[in-house]
Structures are given as C-alpha cells and as structure tokens.
Interface confidence: medium
Amino acid sequence: IIPVEEENPDFWNREAAEALGAAKKLQPAQTAAKNLIIFLGDGMGVSTVTAARILKGQKKDKLGPEIPLAMDRFPYVALSKTYNVDKHVPDSGATATAYLCGVKGNFQTIGLSAAARFNQCNTTRGNEVISVMNRAKKAGKSVGVVTTTRVQHASPAGTYAHTVNRNWYSDADVPASARQEGCQDIATQLISNMDIDVILGGGRKYMFRMGTPDPEYPDDYSQGGTRLDGKNLVQEWLAKRQGARYVWNRTELMQASLDPSVTHLMGLFEPGDMKYEIHRDSTLDPSLMEMTEAALRLLSRNPRGFFLFVEGGRIDHGHHESRAYRALTETIMFDDAIERAGQLTSEEDTLSLVTADHSHVFSFGGYPLRGSSIFGLAPGKARDRKAYTVLLYGNGPGYVLKDGARPDVTESESGSPEYRQQSAVPLDEETHAGEDVAVFARGPQAHLVHGVQEQTFIAHVMAFAACLEPYTACDLAPPAGTTD
C-alpha cells in the first residue's frame, strides 16, 4: 500500500525540511535538572523499538513506521556499549550497575564493582558502588522505583542493592554459608539500604514469611510468602516511616496516590512479576502507565525534585520466550508510560532518559510490504519452500522440527499472541544480544547524550545534570522554577 502523497518528492522534502527546522531550533538547556527520570526498557534493542513503532502505528490504523513513538520524539540520541567486565553479552544485573551507578561490573552481580565475584559473598564488602538514586536521596530529593517485574529483580535492584548474586530475592534464595557471612537478600536491602519514597511493581512473596497466604491467591501455596527468617518486611518498612502506606491492588493504589497524608508508598501487585499487559486484570493490577502516574503524583510534591526509575521489565521476558507479541505489546505500554510522564513533567526542569540494558537476538527482515502485519509472513518462500515470518530469533524455544524439518507457518498462526517465532538454534530460553542499544534524552543537559558511549556514561550524565556526587561542583544554573 503506497500512500499517493509519498510518491511525490515534495512530501519527503517538506517532511525533512520540517525536521531540519526543528533541529536548528534545538537549544541545549544550560540549567541543572531538578528531576531525573530513567525509563529502562529491559531487553529493548533497536529492532524491538522499530518493530514496536510499527505495531503501535498499526494499532492506530496507520501503515506503521511513519508514526513516531513517544521515545522517538526525544531530541538527543546516543549508542550505549552494554558489555559486562567479564562478558561480551551482558545480563540485567551488571548492566544495571553500569547505567545506575556509573561503574561496570561482572555478569549477574548488582551494585558492585568488578572486583566482586559472582556468588562469592566474601567479595562483596568494600566493592559496593552507589547508585544515582541513592545520591539523589542524600541530596534531599524524593526517589521512586516502578517496574513490571518484581521490585527485587535485577534492574530495579540496581537502584538500591549490592549483591554478588542477582537471584538472591529473599533469604530462602541465599545459601546458608552466604547468610552466615553477612550477605543480605535483595528484599531485605530494599527496605534497609536506603529510604525509597515510592516502590511499585511485583514481588510480594519475597516480603513475607513462609506460610503467609497471598491476598490475591490465598489458596495457592506456591504464591505465598517465601521468607525463612520469619520477617514481615512490609510491616518493618511501614513501622519505620510515618505516612507510609502499603497497597496490593489498583484501587488501593489510586486512592493512596491521591491522599496528601501518604508520604511513602509501597505497592506490590503480584507475588512475583506482574502479568503481561495483554493478560493483566485491569480491575486488580495497575498498568505501567498508571504506576508511573501514581509515582509522579507523590514524588513531584518535593520542592527539591525527584529521581524516578521506570522499567518496562517484561519486554525481556517476552523475548526470552520467543514470543514477539508479548515483547512488543510490553514495549508499547512502556512507551505509553513515557508519553504520560512527559505530560506530567516539564522538560524545562526534568531530564528524561530512555534506554535498554541490553538487546536480544531478535530480527526483523524478509522484505515485507509496507502496511503488512508486523507479525505476518515475508512475501516469498524460504529455500525449503515454506513460509517464514518477518520477525525471527537467532536462538530460543522457537526452534521446532516437524518430521525432521522446519514447520510451515500460516499468517493466522504467526499472528497469535501465543506464537513463538522460529529460531536457528534450539534453546530453552532465547538469549540476550551484545550489540549497542539506543539512549534517548530530553531536558536539561540532554545534549550531553551523544555519540557512542560506555553504558556507565548514563549514570554520570544524570549525576552531572542534577549536580549530584561526584559533580556537586557542576557550575550549572539552578533548575527552572527553583526557589532555593
């Protein structure tokens, strides 16, 4: 389907001239940032961004690629090198250390320099690195963490935790020897390492003692508390803070976010990760956009500003399953959250960054016609005379043989939300990829986001923009609208 107007060179010349005009008007804001927001699309490589853009456009009855995502409208872009100190292809723990703390670490460790070794508790002490969120809190800002995964998961944990093993969610996951050496589980660190004003996501089961029934699934033992130390971490968190509230469903979240007496808010909406957006019960669980809005309502009360981490964490999970439908619909909700945050904040005083921790071996090819479904088939047949999808994975559970050969695929099969795209190599889980990912930036000091940078640069840009350690002598004009 070729739009008639696009056949005319004037269309493209005019469109490019408008973009050029906008580019020429770009004025780097020389003020400091009052607020910092980092939007982290877990596993959101460039192919994911492109495919999600097309899907979001097609959901609006457009052809697809011509409609910009909210993140596409950010004026500054860079590439981020995502490798870990010990791995070409990284995990979400060590990458979180890089973009949140400004230091690269080893695979599957969080909040620790590369002097710490995976799973070796005794290498923790002395190798802790401090997140920008922690530095923002020390500077008097309010801070928040919002995610669609467990709040103890690798990416959000990078804002507050220090652990040699990202899988140590609750004390039940920590080996007895490591517990004896003083290594704390991530859930314990969530409530004790620093004062977080807003915590929203999944992960209820890691907060309560073994045998505590889950409020949403009271008869399902597997969803109940996991802790062996007998602690109720939610109760401990509430007891330490006046004006603190704990919620576990959407209705309570909405009420709490509008209540001026609530100063601290913890919302845990599932025992583990939150449900995929396509599976979410909208009466019980908030969307990522709703959680982001609730967090911004609370955090923006602080005249000194805030730091907010927002993660679309299940983009990654959809890709690991080789289910592109899940990954892309999660990306669209993530983009919706970015758009809503943009409406609720001002680029005059808020530095917003959008990036990914790593990519996935997810490809988009095969010369599909413009306007054809992103989940559809390539126009031609493969050498085996069978159809193939335009979205594919390099490896993963989509490798299936039927009578010793690659199975044929139909448009209706490939369009199913449950369909697993085919892969070249059979694995239980599709893997991360090692190529650079994009960093999008808007707001004060966003112009610093340029070129090809180490992933650690992201944390340093945030710290500098808000004049946080180690850039307290940033020599930037105060943020727009600041009174003190």
Epitope: I278, H279, R280, D281, T283, H317, T329, G415, P417, E418
Partner: antibody
Framework: EVKLVESGGGLVQPGGSLSLSCAAS????????MSWVRQPPGKALEWLAL??????????EYSASVKGRFTISRDNSQSILYLQMNALRAEDSATYYC??????????????WGQGTLVTVSA | DTQMTQSPSSLSASLGGKVTITCKAS??????IAWYQYKTGKGPRLLIH???TLQPGIPSRFSGSGSGRDYSFSISNLEPEDIATYYC????????FGGGTKLEIK
C-alpha cells in the same frame, strides 16, 4: 465469584443452525480470553473456539473440526459470549461448555467452566 | 497442531491406593499442561495447571510432573469421590485435550 451460564441448546435438524449464549459475571469480561468446549456422549472433551481479550483485539481461533461452520463472538457491554453454529451434523451432538482462561504463569489455562448446555442434532 | 495421547483410557484401583495417568504431547509444550476432573452433569474441574501447581482448594493427594513432551498426573490415598474421568489439556499452542482416563474403584 466467577459465574458462567450457558443457554440456547436443544434439538436441531442436520444442516440447521443454532446459537449458544454464555452469560458471564463476577469478573471484568473484557480482560479475559473465552472459549467454547464440547463433549459428545461417551467421547472426550474437545476445544472448539477461542476469542481473546480487549488487549489483543478480540481475535479468534478455531479448531479444524468447526472452522468455517462455527463463529465465536462476544457482547462486551452485556458480558455475553456467543457460539453461532451453522451446517450442523449429527457428530456435533454434545454438551457445550463455555470456559474462561486464567493467566497463571503466563499461560492461558481454562480455569472456570459453566454447567453446559445440551445440543442434539437429529432428523 | 499439537496432539495429546493420554493413557490408560481406563483404570481400576483400590481405596487408599495410588494411580498414575500419563499424557504425551506430539511436541514440546513447555510445561503448559493442566489436569481436569470431569463428572457427568458438571463442568470440568481444574485440578492442576502449569504441570504441577495445584489449584486453590485442591487436596495435595493430587500431583503432577513432567517436562518437554512427557507428563504425568497422580492421585494418592484414593477416596470414593475421586471416581471420575480425568483429562489432560495442553495450552502452549491453543488447546488440545487428551482422550481421557476413566477411573473406577475396585
């Protein structure tokens, strides 16, 4: 409490048509995948059709045995699921159930079922 | 389409005893298997989902295991109310039921 109540079953001649309904209550209807399943007398359960939720555009899927003859649809304003059955055959005689999916562990297992409605296709 | 082969088609066991039913999928179903109890005149009752997770309110006498293409379902300490037909269901790729197993008490 999740409740599913089927209706519309009865006796119909071969080649005829019938429309089954399933009234749903106790949950947000638009959030859930819904299916029709049948059990012919003395035979196994057989999944027939699926209609997905709002987030996935209410797309549909059918088993090979009914594709082209049966149509699944939903009235979201009234929380009613439908199965329009055309060109009925004797082998379509069965108890027909509507079922709601639950998303445990990101699957889509059929967790809630109605009591069923009996369809008999006979001359 | 994924096919499910359930065996045995019927079995007889003593009260207090244990029975095991198996289902084999025609391809890997990634643990997306459920087990149902079916009694005439009632809708099927979900007992287990995701291979081994018991539904709320289902006694621990019921259990499930397996991976890949091979799955099993067991009932221990058989009770009179366990007389029913049991079905497996794969839900990895749309839905397919097994052929059913009719359980009788000796």
């Amino acid at each position: 409490e999740v409740k599913l109540v089927e209706s519309g079953g009865g006796l119909v001649q071969p080649g005829g048509s019938l429309s089954l309904s399933c009234a749903a209550s106790g949950f947000t209807f638009t959030d859930y995948y819904m299916s029709w399943v049948r059990q012919p007398p003395g035979k196994a359960l057989e999944w027939l059709a699926l209609i997905r939720n709002k987030a996935t555009g209410y797309t549909t899927e059918y088993s090979a045995s009914v594709k082209g003859r049966f149509t699944i649809s939903r009235d979201n304003s009234q929380s009613i699921l439908y199965l329009q059955m055309n060109a009925l055959r004797a082998e379509d005689s069965a108890t027909y159930y509507c079922a709601r999916a639950s998303f445990y562990y990101d699957g889509k297992v059929l967790a809630y079922w109605g009591q069923g409605t009996l369809v008999t296709v006979s001359a | 389409d994924t096919q499910m082969t359930q065996s045995p088609s019927s079995l007889s066991a003593s009260l207090g005893g244990k029975v095991t039913i198996t289902c084999k999928a025609s391809q890997d179903i990634n643990k997306y298997i459920a087990w149902y109890q079916y009694k005439t005149g009632k809708g099927p009752r979900l007992l287990i989902h995701y291979t081994s997770t018991l539904q709320p309110g289902i006694p621990s006498r019921f259990s499930g295991s397996g991976s890949g293409r091979d799955y099993s379902f067991s009932i221990s300490n058989l009770e009179p109310e366990d007389i029913a037909t049991y079905y497996c269901l794969q839900y990895d790729n749309l839905y397919t039921f097994g052929g059913g197993t009719k359980l009788e008490i000796k």
